[in-house]
Amino acid sequence: REAAPKSYAIRDSRQMVWVLSGNSLIAAPLSRSIKPVTLHLIACRDTEFSDKEKGNMVYLGIKGKDLCLFCAEIQGKPTLQLKEKNIMDLYVEKKAQKPFLFFHNKEGSTSVFQSVSYPGWFIATSTTSGQPIFLTKERGITNNTNFYLDSVE
């Protein structure tokens, strides 16, 4: 039986959710007037890059779209992007697709996502509404790297 990705709405401690704006992900306040993305999450079967201390290796996609989160270096800086890719195509690959992989770690009731390609770089939202979801190596006051994964029916 083929595995299915788990579905979540994603929210931070300031009640910001992830929203698709064109082909970019931005953070916006939880509000009736905006439609948050449903995040698809599925574990990677290949253990080549695994590191249990950092968490489980997962692929992240946008439900209802052939879009997956992807890390690439732009002008020398690790950058978070969306790439046209079906999450199940990544899952069925025998070899781990490193740029699409994230370490998913639980910190209390929150989730943290660290790039496998760029260790020490985490998915983050800024404190300002409407800004893109990005990668940061600075966890703390100005960036939020802890997220709540809310079950959606």
């Epitope: 009640q15 939880l30 009736r32 509404s129």
Partner: antibody, heavy 122, light 111 residues
Framework: ELQLQESGPGLVKPSETLSLTCTVS??????????WGWIRQPPGKGLEWIGS???????YYNPSLKSRVTISVDTSKNQFSLKLSSVTAADTAVYYC??????????????WGQGTLVTVSS | ESVLTQPPSVSGAPGQRVTISCTGS?????????VHWYQQLPGTAPKLLIY???NRPSGVPDRFSGSKSGTSASLAITGLQAEDEADYYC???????????FGGGTKLTVL
């Protein structure tokens, strides 16, 4: 249908700790995406949010009360509780518990308890 | 002092239209968090009247409507009735406080 009922002592002495419980019926306190809050209303005044706890166990407190407030959940009794320490006469109020759901009421409170009056006096 | 500002009182004659304003800031209403409105009849708990800026829960008459623009929101009541006499509160979320905020309340008197 979700219902909330506050309970606890109606009289608390100054400098002591106020303790209230909200019993949830018609649904589970651990149900996904719900948040549970405490709001108070001093006599003749407006509403003040004290703090909240959600289904993940995450707590959020009013910065002006944070040093004195603890909110917790007892899943076995389907209840959540408020503790407010070092009370003074200024804490005399009707205390309400209320709830909402993240992706349905969008940070509003759609179900409220009937409220309980707590008087701080020696 | 409340984070959201409302007029202390408004009044109107039966059948008239009244509006109640609610002014916030760039960290709450202006940051695009929703505004909710509550009606509190004398001696009772608040009741959700409008949620998500302009949506009525089932059972709330369509005489009540909400709107939002910039850092402000307003509640309108048309065809004023004696039973509308109550206190009305706006509420939103404030990211700088990481918490829920209320207006100071507005007492509506039906003349």
């Amino acid at each position: 249908e979700l219902q909330l009922q506050e309970s606890g002592p109606g009289l608390v002495k100054p400098s002591e700790t106020l303790s209230l419980t909200c019993t949830v019926s018609g649904g589970s306190i651990t149900a996904s995406n719900y948040y549970w809050g405490w709001i108070r209303q001093p006599p003749g005044k407006g509403l003040e949010w004290i703090g909240s706890i959600d289904y993940t166990g995450s707590t959020y407190y009013n910065p002006s009360l944070k040093s004195r407030v603890t909110i917790s959940v007892d899943t076995s009794k389907n209840q959540f509780s408020l503790k407010l320490s070092s009370v003074t006469a200024a804490d005399t109020a009707v205390y309400y518990c209320a709830t909402g759901k993240y992706y349905e009421t969008y940070l509003g409170f759609d179900v409220w308890g009937q409220g309980t009056l707590v008087t701080v006096s020696s | 002092e409340s984070v959201l500002t409302q007029p202390p009182s408004v009044s109107g004659a039966p059948g008239q239209r009244v509006t109640i304003s609610c002014t916030g800031s760039s960290s709450n209403i202006g940051a695009h968090y929703d505004v909710h409105w509550y009606q509190q009849l004398p001696g009772t708990a608040p009741k959700l009247l409008i949620y998500g800026n302009d949506n009525r829960p089932s059972g709330v008459p369509d005489r009540f409507s909400g709107s939002k623009s910039g850092t402000s929101a307003s509640l309108a009541i048309t065809g004023l009735q004696a039973e509308d006499e109550a206190d009305y509160y706006c509420q939103s979320y404030d990211y700088s406080l990481s918490g829920y905020v209320f207006g100071g309340g507005t007492k509506l008197t039906v003349l």
